[in-house]
């Protein structure tokens, strides 16, 4: 059922989520800046075709439009999306020593955000019985592919987070 901003979600949960989204956005921006500065990979739009051939997926948030938001479906898609990005970030491991610490922090922050969403789903009795299984992740055959993959994953994640932020902010409005 569609649900407007006056939802059953606690304000403390929504504020925590907004904090976490902004933390991850900062991590993602730092990764993008380092990929640009170190490897001159600055424009994700130039790598779209490579992204298709590498099989880097997008996470949908189709249950989250503010006009017809389905709470259970939206939270589930948020969690599934974060779960997907955990796998994509894991596939980037070993991208380069310079990027390692930034990627490590991003990975953990995404996992912690997924935990926050799951906790709330559990409290509302909406949590799926089992964790979704991780789908096939892209295999990067070269250092360049992994770095280009890093640019695309970071770009996809930022887009996902922008939508997430808008949805959460809409829900947080009194």
């Amino acid at each position: 059922t569609p649900l407007g901003p006056a939802s059953s979600l606690p304000q403390s949960f929504l504020l925590k989520c907004l904090e976490q989204v902004r933390k991850i956005q900062g991590d993602g921006a730092a990764l993008q800046e380092k990929l640009c500065a170190t490897y001159k990979l600055c424009h994700p739009e130039e790598l779209v075709l490579l992204g298709h051939s590498l099989g880097i997926p997008w996470a949908p948030l189709s249950s989250c439009p503010s006009q017809a938001l389905q709470l259970a479906g939206c939270l589930s898609q948020l969690h599934s999306g974060l779960f997907l990005y955990q796998g994509l970030l894991q596939a980037l491991e070993g991208i380069s020593p310079e990027l390692g610490p930034t990627l490590d922090t991003l990975q953990l922050d995404v996992a912690d955000f997924a935990t926050t969403i799951w906790q709330q789903m559990e409290e509302l009795g909406m949590a799926p019985a089992l964790q979704p299984t991780q789908g096939a992740m892209p295999a990067f055959a070269s250092a360049f592919q992994r770095r280009a993959g890093g640019v695309l994953v970071a770009s996809h994640l930022q887009s996902f987070l922008e939508v997430s932020y808008r949805v959460l902010r809409h829900l947080a409005q009194p």
Partner: antibody
């Protein structure tokens, strides 16, 4: 309520390995990361790394990358830390602590496991 | 890695008196989201550490309000308004802004 119960004290010879367990109860185990922290005798706390049981991903403090291996068994809600090529400086109490964000981070700790390395 | 430095390392206090512990980080822990990723833990004798303060100034569940914490991006202070016997132990500041998480050396609070 949340409980983290660690395996008992171990005495090992230099060069040996040891595997410490941390059994979790009172929450959905795969959803939270599990962190490991070292405390050498009379010393402070050092973060070793964490395991994300949902995807089996482990991340390590560079200092412990060749020392510790973190794993998790979702079926038994247990996290493990294996320490290899033990030396006297590995003698310490090792803690597991549940991860999370905000007031959830390290809000729950195991009781600690003393690993003594002695010839 | 972010280095956390505490002072003093030892703090003898008379019960009922205030106490103050300082912590300094080698990098600002204030994120652009407005949150300062600074935590305080207390390890009582013979026990595991326990969470006292999260995100610089928030009291963890069950922590008495005689504890408070404040600071800037790099300089932080934990205050106990009136020390009680049960407050003895080692206090650690820690950062979780970025990996690896790091802790201060610890401040041992003891009763005079």
């Amino acid at each position: 309520q949340v409980h983290l119960v660690q395996s008992g004290a171990e005495v090992k010879k230099p060069g040996a390995s040891v595997k410490v367990s941390c059994k979790a109860s009172g929450y959905t185990f795969p959803i939270y990361t599990m962190h490991w922290i070292k405390q050498a005798p009379g010393q402070g706390l050092e973060w070793i790394g964490y395991i994300n049981p949902s995807i089996g991903y482990a991340n390590y403090n560079q200092k412990f990358r060749d020392k510790a291996t973190l794993t998790a068994d979702k079926s038994t809600s247990t996290a493990y830390m294996e320490l290899s090529s033990l030396r006297s400086e590995d003698t310490a109490v090792y803690y597991c602590a549940r991860g999370g964000y905000g007031d959830s981070l390290f809000a729950y700790w195991g009781q600690g496991t003393l690993v003594t390395v002695s010839s | 890695d972010i280095v956390m430095t505490q002072s003093p390392l030892s703090l003898p206090v008379t019960p009922g008196e205030p106490a103050s512990i300082s912590c300094r980080s080698s990098k600002s822990l204030l994120h652009s989201n407005g949150i300062t990723y600074l935590y305080w833990y207390l390890q009582k004798p013979g026990q595991s550490p326990q969470l006292l303060i999260y995100q610089m100034s928030n009291l963890a569940s069950g922590v008495p309000d005689r504890f408070s914490s404040s600071g800037s991006g790099t300089d932080f202070t934990l205050k106990i308004s009136r020390v009680e016997a049960e407050d003895v132990g080692v206090y650690y500041c820690a950062q979780n802004l970025e990996l690896p998480y790091t802790f201060g050396q610890g401040t041992k609070l003891e009763i005079k």
